[in-house]
Interface confidence: low
């Protein structure tokens, strides 16, 4: 029988009492047309929604926005729209909110066709007042708020302008024209790229890189001959286009793009493309394209400077630059990512890595499923996870998977279990443990969130006919109850609740449909009576994450240490609440070959802990680039790996020699680079 | 308009293998899939399996599993559906189908399987010593 | 794999009058079903999908109705042209299915 319909599963005393009492309808006087919807800080409980309604007319479109606000999780919403003096608001813009609990809300107006600039409209007390501000400029982006202080903004315009506030959008200057991209870095330093000649498209591969650390007063030109550039963890890096030919190559700085080195990855052509999976203050994933229109390319994994690369997985699926890839960090547990490998007979298959890329296996296959039809073997298959490429492929997956950093181990997929990726319905899958091990949770597609740090997982069925049905499960997902929230069935839109799953509360968004009209409407139900008491110590059971073997010694050793943690027990119905911190306790592992990556030139076979040296650089000296300089590596094949934490055991020897030779690197080096003032 | 052109019958002998082409037009063709039926005589419909022009993968029928091969080629948008190790058994009328397999689109009334929409001629194999 | 059973084997139906066919899945195949038309020499054609959506051009006497396991095709008044062979498919799980077809002659 499916999860949650067997005898085992017990019921929730007196469920629907306790939440028809807490389910909260709001019919929004809206036409449907589209609604966005933001949470304001973080256990504020204020939400925005902005709903947009476009009336097409023969020769313009007339637009119409209305804004709602609610400050007790969106069980009530009160229009605001007349704080914005009924303007009509860009929705490609969204709605800008600040860092952290700053706030701060920046709304952009739809302005006539005439006018000089754009119009914004500014709150910095949750949304409770608004200030319009006349732009000088019109914005082609959403205002961009620094991460180090939300008074800071910058944005660019139409007119490929750099524009900086340091009041909170009251006043503007424009910095720096012919800008293509612009990012906060860290200490509200700003990086962008700025063309010459022609335009950003014209110039790619001949735009400098510039740097502002004093929001514009002064400016140090930290590259040339660049193509993009990106911001990951601590690392700076650029691609830059090589002296002779087409092809472009990646540099990195950890120190603001005062300095770089060449990173060793395969340099790339016009048609291919590189891209930062995932980057934190130890590594960097990168994506290399393979040359031609594969589909695929190399995840390469870096050591902690970003400069020395090891590969990490091949036929990694990337359809095309900014497209799709079903690259997922499972941020439930350390040192887990998930991807799809594109194999040799063109299917589709999922790879999981539990020691942050060191080596990559498929997903078990779940206990009370079966193999489909792209099994050959019906016994030995896998479970493959539909992301991304799936949602942009438009199979019937409504969502992508969910981990939560405060829901320890668990993720919620969509999946197929045979030999890849299968095109037929998929059903949801859960794993309590980080990804080791998988369990059916429920049958054909599913909308899905985790309420209160995983003690409450809810879902919706993803059905083209109204619904009227929630389902919920106390125990991760192993037993499911289904509530009717409403008499009248509604055509479902989405799932809302606030980021963290901390809260209690979720959303139901649709709209109603009669003959002549279609309004947007929301349920918000809170499940605080369905935990009706707080968990107590008893309520937790220790659990050793990443464990495979419990008579091992180094059991649960991942990255150089283990973590134990405090898990809820699937029996307990209690709440872990808005202040539930995860409790864990970390201790550090004996090293191992498990510890290492391969070094440069070096290549861990397959289903080998061994490191051997690739042969086609057998008995040449190992030479890279760094600081401009070259170095000669003196190696026996291993460097430990970024964030791990092992102490004694195995130590490989691993010495890096200064060989006072200038690098073939057409980038600029420090001693080249110019500082300039406004 | 959209229609799929398949290629002309074929008579094999017993063990030889089968190559049927599907070339479509009059829409995006890597916006579908497309399935591949057979209709033996005088018999219903089998389906054999199905390709996603996008990254050319497939799912078979276990029943064609290691005889059936499908590919597709994006420059000419045409599929192909290869059946080797052919036996008496396998005299039929072939079929492409554009087959939506699975597309969710938005909106009321069309997130459900939208059924293979488009088919092309058939084209008869026959298989006989 | 899922298996489609549909009955009558054979409906003798007179025009104008209504013709109902069953079609039942092994296992729930939800809303995932399409039911097709063929015709002698000719490929299938494609009536209805999401188990009760008429596909474009198809005329409103053809109309489905079911969800889960038990699902009927319904031909309000017959018409001449109406006269053939008739199939359900699933897609829910692969391999997708067929129903073993239900030939509807004149009575």
């Known amino acids: 029988s499916a999860p949650g319909e067997d005898e085992e599963c017990g019921r929730v005393r007196d469920f629907v009492a306790k939440l028809a009492n807490n389910t909260h309808q709001h019919v929004f006087d809206d036409l449907r047309g589209s609604v966005s919807l933001s949470w304001v800080g973080d256990s504020t409980g204020v939400i925005l929604v902005l709903t947009t309604f476009h009336v097409p007319l023969v020769i313009m479109t007339f637009g119409q926005s209305k804004l709602y606000r609610s400050e007790d999780y969106g069980k009530n919403f009160k229009d605001i729209t007349d704080l914005i003096n009924n303007t009509f608001i860009r929705t490609e813009f969204g709605m800008a909110i600040g860092p952290e609990n700053s706030g701060k809300v920046v709304l952009t107006a739809e302005v006539s066709g005439g006018s000089r600039g754009g119009r914004i409209f500014r709150s910095s007390d949750f949304a409770k007042n608004f200030v319009q501000t006349d732009l000088p400029f019109h914005p082609l982006t959403q205002m961009m708020y620094s991460p180090q202080n939300s008074d800071y903004l910058l944005a660019l315009s139409t007119e490929n302008g750099l524009w900086v506030s340091k009041n909170f959008g009251g006043k503007w200057e424009e910095i720096h024209k012919a800008v293509c991209l612009a990012k906060w870095g860290s200490d509200n330093t700003i990086f962008f790229t700025t063309y010459a000649n022609g335009s950003c498209k014209a110039d790619l591969g001949a735009l400098e890189l510039w740097r502002t650390s004093d929001l514009g007063k002064s400016f140090k030109t930290i590259g040339v001959k660049i193509y993009s550039f990106g911001l990951g963890g601590r690392f700076l890096f650029a691609s830059v286009m090589a002296d002779k030919d087409t092809t472009r190559r990646i540099h990195v700085s950890t120190d603001q793009g005062d300095t770089w080195s060449m990173a060793q990855l395969p340099s790339v052509g016009q048609e291919q493309f590189y891209s930062i999976l995932a980057a934190n203050d130890d590594m960097v994933f990168m994506h290399v394209d393979e040359p031609g229109d594969t589909g695929f390319g190399t995840i390469f994994t870096s050591d902690d400077r970003g400069i020395v690369y090891s590969k990490s997985l091949d036929r990694h699926l990337y359809t095309t630059t900014g497209g799709e890839t079903d690259f997922t960090n499972v941020t439930s547990l350390r040192g887990v990512y998930i991807t799809s490998v594109l194999s040799e007979d063109n299917s589709i298959q999922t790879m999981i890595t539990f020691d942050q890329g060191g080596r990559w296996t498929h997903l078990r296959k779940p206990e009370n499923s079966e193999c489909d039809a792209t099994a050959k073997n019906k016994n030995e298959c896998s479970l493959h996870i539909h992301a991304s490429y799936s949602i942009s492929q438009k199979l019937n997956v409504p969502m992508a998977p969910l981990s939560e950093p405060n829901a320890v181990g668990i993720v919620i997929a969509h999946g197929s279990v045979g030999d890849a990726i299968s095109v037929m319905v998929p059903d949801v899958y859960i794993s309590d443990d980080g990804g080791y091990s998988w369990t059916k949770m429920l049958e054909g597609p599913h909308y899905y969130t985790i309420l209160d740090s995983g003690g409450i997982i809810v879902a919706i069925e993803h059905s083209s006919r109204p619904i009227n049905v929630i389902k919920f499960s106390t125990d991760e997902g192993q037993c499911w109850q289904t509530y009717t929230f409403t008499r009248d069935p509604i055509y479902f839109t989405g799932l809302a609740s606030e980021p963290g799953a901390r809260s209690m509360n979720i959303s139901i968004w649709g709209f109603t449909e009669s003959f002549l009209t279609s309004q947007w409407v929301s349920y918000t139900i809170d499940f605080k009576d369905i935990l009706e008491r707080n968990c107590e110590e008893k309520d937790y059971t220790i659990w050793l994450a990443h464990s495979t073997d419990p008579e091992d010694y180094e059991d649960g050793c991942i990255l150089g240490y283990k973590e134990q943690f405090l898990r809820l027990r699937k029996s307990s119905v209690c709440q872990n609440g808005r202040d539930y911190v995860v409790t864990k306790q970390p201790s550090i592992c004996l090293c191992s070959l498990e510890d290492f990556l391969c070094d440069f030139g070096y290549y861990r076979p397959e289903n080998d802990s061994k490191c051997v040296e690739q042969p086609e650089l057998k008995g040449h000296d190992l030479e890279f680039c760094l600081y401009g300089r070259e170095e000669h590596l003196t190696t026996n094949g291993y460097r430990k790996i970024p964030g791990d934490k092992c102490q004694g055991g195995v130590n490989p020897v691993r010495e890096v020699k200064d060989l006072k030779k200038k690098c073939t690197s057409n980038f600029l080096s420090p001693e080249k680079q110019n500082s300039k003032s406004n | 308009q959209v229609q799929l052109v398949q290629s002309g019958a074929e008579v094999k002998k017993p063990g030889a293998s089968v190559k049927v082409s599907c070339k479509a037009s009059?829409?995006?063709?890597?916006?579908?899939?497309m399935s591949w039926v057979r209709q033996a005589p005088g018999q219903g419909l089998e389906w054999m399996g199905i390709i996603n022009p996008v990254g050319g993968s497939t799912s078979y029928a276990q029943k064609f599993q290691g005889r059936v091969t499908m590919t597709r080629d994006t420059s000419t948008s045409t599929v192909y559906m290869e059946l080797s190790s052919l036996r008496s058994e396998d005299t039929a009328v072939y079929y492409c189908a554009r087959d939506p397999s699975g597309i969710a689109l938005a909106g009321p009334g069309s997130r459900y399987y939208r059924g293979m929409d488009v088919w092309g001629q058939g084209t008869t194999v026959t298989v006989s010593s | 794999e899922i298996v489609m059973t549909q009955s009558p084997a054979t409906l003798s139906v007179s025009p104008g009058e209504r013709a109902t066919l069953s079609c039942r899945a092994s296992?729930?195949?939800?809303?995932?079903l399409a039911w097709y038309q063929q015709k002698p020499g000719q490929a299938p054609r494609l009536l209805i999908y999401?188990?009760?959506t008429r596909a474009t051009g198809i005329p409103a006497r053809f109309s489905g109705s079911g969800s889960g396991t038990e699902f009927t095709l319904t031909i309000s008044s017959l018409q001449s042209e109406d006269f053939a062979v008739y199939y359900c498919?699933?897609?829910?799980?692969?391999?997708?299915?067929f129903g073993g077809g239900t030939k509807v002659e004149i009575k």
């Open positions: 999401g188990a009760s």
């Open positions: 296992q729930s195949v939800s809303s995932n």
């Open positions: 498919q699933q897609a829910r799980l692969g391999p997708w299915t």
């Open positions: 009059g829409y995006t063709f890597t916006s579908r899939y």
